[in-house]
């Protein structure tokens, strides 16, 4: 039970088109060392949404940057949501490796659904 766990407290989130969606994720430990990544979908075809270590993700803001929450919080906010953003999002912890980081543990996922923009 001391082993790191990845917690996504919302099983599902519904957001209106054009708004921002916050997807929450926390770790129970900083060990093992390694980055956090967010994906949409699972398996080989999953889409990288955010990589803590590298990359440019213009629509994604880490919540900790906004609120100075503690360093176990890896929640993200995705701006200007469209119906194409619907899907299940996974917060995934990687273990630092050489040459490549190795997936260590995934959260249970948060299903994002998109409502029509209120008239």
């Amino acid at each position: 039970e001391d082993e790191l766990q990845v917690i996504q407290p919302e099983k599902s989130v519904s957001v209106a088109a054009g708004e921002s969606a916050t997807l929450r994720c926390a770790m129970t430990s900083l060990i093992p060392v390694g980055p956090i990544m967010w994906f949409r979908g699972a398996g080989a075809g999953r889409e990288l949404i955010y990589n803590q270590k590298e990359g440019h993700f213009p629509r994604v803001t880490t919540v900790s940057e906004l609120t100075k929450r503690n360093n176990l919080d890896f929640s993200i906010s995705i701006s200007n949501i469209t119906p194409a953003d619907a899907g299940t999002y996974y917060c995934v912890k990687f273990r630092k490796g050489s040459p490549d980081d190795v997936e260590f543990k995934s959260g249970a996922g948060t299903e994002l659904s998109v409502r029509a923009k209120p008239s």
């Epitope: 039970e1 766990q5 917690i7 996504q8 407290p9 919302e10 099983k11 989130v13 519904s14 957001v15 209106a16 708004e19 921002s20 969606a21 916050t22 929450r24 926390a26 129970t28 609120t67 929450r69 503690n70 176990l72 919080d73 906010s77 249970a108």
Partner: antibody, heavy 120, light 106 residues
Framework: QVQLVQSGAEVKKPGASVKVSCKAS????????MHWVRQAPGQGLEWMGI????????SYAQKFQGRVTMTRDTSTSTVYMELSSLRSEDTAVYYC?????????????WGQGTLVTVSS | DIQMTQSPSSVSASVGDRVTITCRAS??????LAWYQQKPGKAPKLLIY???SLQSGVPSRFSGSGSGTDFTLTISSLQPEDFATYYC????????FGGGTKVEIK
């Protein structure tokens, strides 16, 4: 100081809808999630769902999916919970409750409760 | 959904007694657990969060422990104002409350 003030008691007929409000004050409204929890007479607490007042995103307990709608009005720092297709089993006290700060996903301040009675 | 089972459902005790309430989760929830106190006709009040952290303003006679699936709320020396119903709540996946434990006067 943090305050959550809810609307008054309601009596509704089966099949009708009810909309309960919760006005927040004493803190930055958009910085804290809000939950709704209900309690039937003599029973325990039942979590209904959550709303992020910042973007308006919502997450509902499976039991209430399709029947509950949570909304917010940032101009008045008010959240709303609407429950439709009411039945007698929905008779309960409905509470709004603010989620704590900083990844503390617990309920640190509660409204006074709103009694909703469903009776023909 | 994660189920939370509290025991006992009620306990009779006297002022000064040590009271222990347990809460079991249907799956591991790490330390993502809170305890609330509710008095008749009032809203619940947060006592303990993150399994063992005391909420500001709560007397130190209240303590929480546990991790994984088994958790405990202890009142070290019961006071007259402590007679109430206590609920556990998980925050690991959505939210779920336990069924409650009523602490009554013996």
């Amino acid at each position: 100081q943090v305050q959550l003030v809810q609307s008054g008691a309601e009596v509704k007929k089966p099949g009708a809808s009810v909309k309960v409000s919760c006005k927040a004050s004493g803190y930055t409204f958009t910085s804290y999630y809000m939950h709704w929890v209900r309690q039937a007479p003599g029973q325990g607490l039942e979590w209904m769902g959550i709303i992020n007042p910042s973007g308006g995103s919502t997450s509902y307990a499976q039991k209430f999916q399709g029947r509950v709608t949570m909304t917010r009005d940032t101009s008045t720092s008010t959240v709303y919970m609407e429950l439709s297709s009411l039945r007698s089993e929905d008779t309960a006290v409905y509470y709004c409750a603010r989620e704590g700060p900083e990844q503390l996903w617990y309920l640190d301040y509660w409204g006074q409760g709103t009694l909703v009675t469903v009776s023909s | 959904d994660i189920q939370m089972t509290q025991s006992p459902s009620s306990v009779s005790a006297s002022v000064g007694d040590r009271v222990t309430i347990t809460c079991r989760a249907s799956q591991g929830i790490s330390s993502w657990l809170a305890w609330y106190q509710q008095k008749p006709g009032k809203a619940p009040k947060l006592l303990i969060y993150a399994a063992s952290s005391l909420q500001s303003g709560v007397p130190s006679r209240f303590s929480g422990s546990g991790s994984g699936t088994d958790f405990t709320l202890t009142i070290s020396s019961l006071q007259p104002e402590d007679f109430a119903t206590y609920y556990c709540q998980q925050a690991f996946s959505h939210r779920t409350f336990g069924g409650g434990t009523k602490v009554e006067i013996k």
